[in-house]
Interface confidence: low
Amino acid sequence: ITCPPPMSVEHADIWVKSYSLYSRERYICNSGFKRKAGTSSLTECVLNKATNVAHWTTPSLKCIRDPALVHQRPAPPSTVTTAGVTPQPESLSPSGKEPAASSPSSNNTAATTAAIVPGSQLMPSKSPSTGTTEISSHESSHGTPSQTTAKNWELTASASHQPPGVYPQGHSDTT
């Protein structure tokens, strides 16, 4: 069982290495933002036993403007690189970041991993707050090793919350 792509979090990105059940991944606050104390960037692929559908737990992460970087212009909303270019993780700046999650992985690759179609765009998003098949859980202290590791990195773009149909410049979502 695999999870679909995780929801996006305002001012944060996530690069999913494994979509397998019990995989644990971390969101990274965008440049110019840092993790608010007391919030967690962790999300885990879990199974809703009532529906037998896997989904990502909702992270408590809040990315706030980094006061140390107020003199800099905030980075524009993230977008996926265009056709033929595989998104790669950026080097992480130390401010306000949690340590990266360690994900032991096996050699069994690609069977259940997801990948973005080259040339496709990710839309700005708002995190659903509640849902029929969504269950929230506290971070467990025990980490289950990821069963599958993605060869291709996936970048989930996020942007500031906008009213439906209104998007930051550079995005198009006509209906």
Partner: nanobody
Framework: EVQLVESGGGLVQAGGSLRLACAAS????????MGWFRQAPGKGRDFVAG????????VYTGSVKGRFTISRDNAKNAMYLDMISLKPEDTAVYYC?????????????????WGQGTQVTVSS
């Protein structure tokens, strides 16, 4: 409430192709991220492919990448899954799914509407 009805399933030989369709009725279809899941006999329901509200963003699980193509026609309130080079392991009931609360065109985060499913059987 969005109602979803799948069609297009059937029996096909390995290497063959099928086109599944999902007809949606209800509000704001064009803003709902949608996707296809499948459930093989005795197994859980797995994510297959997802598409953003606009249709620009598409994502696939690795085992179908290059063989399956998800698309949607918002004018017709329809979503499709074109499947080629089918394999016996693709045999499953295929479900159309929607995230109707998330109306800004992003990926499925929480599925709250399901179709009844359509059976796809690939014989060797």
């Amino acid at each position: 409430e969005v109602q979803l009805v799948e069609s297009g399933g059937g029996l096909v030989q390995a290497g063959g192709s099928l086109r599944l369709a999902c007809a949606a009725s209800g509000r704001t279809f064009s803003k709902n991220p949608m996707g296809w899941f499948r459930q093989a006999p005795g197994k859980g329901r797995d994510f297959v492919a997802g598409i953003s509200g606009s249709g620009f963003g598409k994502v696939y699980t690795g085992s179908v990448k290059g063989r399956f193509t998800i698309s949607r026609d918002n004018a017709k309130n329809a979503m499709y899954l074109d499947m080629i080079s089918l394999k016996p392991e693709d045999t499953a009931v295929y479900y159309c799914a929607a995230d109707t609360r998330n109306r800004d065109g992003t990926w499925i985060g929480v599925v709250d509407s399901w179709g009844q499913g359509t059976q796809v059987t690939v014989s060797s």
